[in-house]
């Protein structure tokens, strides 16, 4: 109706949001799976990590990811310099010194080795979704979420709040 979606319009300034404090408010080691219960796995290939979305064989151990939670100010959409409450951001690390990164140019999700402080591309707004699912919105590209495409993780643009419930951007977190 306004030529720009609610998600895009409201979150266009997410990259301006300030993360409160350098250290995370808490950390959580969990396995990550899709809405359809496929596992997200990480494999070392040619000295770099690849990310896969696959069905695990029975009794096959799930890969774990360390989620680090950060409290962040949410920027106001009115003036652009105000604050409209708080939100939770996460970084995701499947192994020491490697973090999931949003590659907005390639619309891909990659594992990069890096030192702290982590770049903005490693931060994702965590959304609490229905059916015990979450979704991950890019800090650097509001309205763009981690999703599943062709058995890989990819960046998927969500053009309206109605599409926030699209199954391919919904994930489950589990301690087992």
């Amino acid at each position: 109706a306004f030529g720009i979606s609610g998600v895009q319009k409201y979150t266009r300034a997410l990259h301006d949001s300030s993360i409160t404090g350098i250290s995370p408010i808490t950390e959580y080691l969990a396995s990550l799976s899709t809405y359809n219960d496929q596992s997200i796995t990480f494999a070392l290939e040619d000295e770099s990590y690849e990310i896969y979305v696959e069905d695990l064989k029975k009794d096959e151990k799930k890969d774990k990811v360390l989620l680090s939670y950060y409290e962040s100010q949410h920027p106001s959409n009115e003036s652009g310099d105000g604050v409209d409450g708080k939100m939770l951001m996460v970084t995701l690390s499947p192994t020491k010194d490697f973090w999931l990164h949003a590659n907005n140019k390639e619309h891909s999700v990659e594992l990069h080795k890096c030192e702290k402080p982590l770049p903005d591309q490693a931060f994702f707004v965590l959304h609490n979704m229905h059916s015990n699912c979450v979704s991950f919105e890019c800090k650097t590209d509001p309205g763009v979420f981690i999703g599943v495409k062709d058995n890989h993780l990819a960046l998927i643009k969500v053009d309206s709040s109605e599409n926030l419930c699209t199954e391919n951007i919904l994930f489950k977190l589990s301690e087992t």
């Epitope: 969990a30 106001s76 409450g85 708080k86 939100m87 939770l88 959304h127 709040s161 926030l164």
Partner: antibody, heavy 119, light 111 residues
Framework: EVQLVESGGGLVQPGGSLRLSCAAS????????MSWVRQAPGKGLEWVAT????????DYVDSVKGRFTISRDNSKNTLYLQMNSLRAEDTAVYYC????????????WGQGTLVTVSS | EIVLTQSPATLSLSPGERATLSCRAS??????????LNWFQQKPGQPPRLLIF???NRGSGIPARFSGSGSGTDFTLTISSLEPEDFAVYYC?????????FGQGTKVEIK
């Protein structure tokens, strides 16, 4: 400035109906989950219903299921609560609330509108 | 449903004193590694105001004298030094699962 303004409260007889409205401003309405929370006179807070930003999901407390309907019109930045088959125990101040961005907690509250169910 | 029990029901203190409010859940409110327990302040004739989210994080514009702690089922709201404007009713609330539930409230009154 983020604002929520409720309206539509009043006196209604048991078995009657009422529709509450909540006009939102200062934020992109469709990006946020919205809820109704009520408070009976001199009592504590009770969550009533929630609707997701895209209208896909709704949830209700058991005591109002089948009687109350939460809805929203994102083009009008307005949240509604249709209340049917009202009972004396529904008498309360009804607050409109907005979740934070990401939908983890009730962050913004309106001033409330009083609903009185009495004969 | 998750039942939240607050204690004490009333706390009578003087300005400058430390207030400690308790909230106990009937089951864990942990989800995704977060303690989804929030605290609200309500003054007469006013709507509730978010003080603390996810057990220990202050809402926007909330003074540092307010702090939250706890995990699992036991949580505490502490006001380090009461100001005159802090005398109010305080509610804990869980956002782990539907139905979202509130504690019955603790009234902090002037002694």
């Amino acid at each position: 400035e983020v604002q929520l303004v409720e309206s539509g409260g009043g006196l209604v007889q048991p078995g009657g109906s009422l529709r509450l409205s909540c006009a939102a401003s200062g934020f992109t309405f469709s990006s946020f989950s919205m809820s109704w929370v009520r408070q009976a006179p001199g009592k504590g807070l009770e969550w009533v219903a929630t609707i997701s930003g895209g209208k896909t999901f709704t949830d209700y407390v058991d005591s109002v299921k089948g009687r109350f309907t939460i809805s929203r019109d994102n083009s009008k930045n307005t949240l509604y609560l249709q209340m049917n088959s009202l009972r004396a125990e529904d008498t309360a101040v009804y607050y409109c609330t907005r979740a934070n961005y990401g939908n983890w907690f009730f962050e913004v509250w309106g001033q409330g509108t009083l609903v009185t169910v009495s004969s | 449903e998750i039942v939240l029990t607050q204690s004490p029901a009333t706390l009578s203190l003087s300005p400058g004193e430390r207030a400690t409010l308790s909230c106990r859940a009937s089951e864990s409110v942990a989800k995704y590694g977060l303690s989804l327990l929030n605290w609200f302040q309500q003054k007469p004739g006013q709507p509730p105001r978010l003080l603390i989210f996810a057990a220990s994080n202050r809402g926007s514009g909330i003074p540092a004298r307010f702090s939250g702690s706890g995990s699992g089922t036991d949580f505490t709201l502490t006001i380090s030094s009461l100001e005159p404007e802090d005398f109010a009713v305080y509610y804990c609330q869980q956002s782990k699962e539907v139905p979202f539930t509130f504690g019955q409230g603790t009234k902090v009154e002037i002694k």
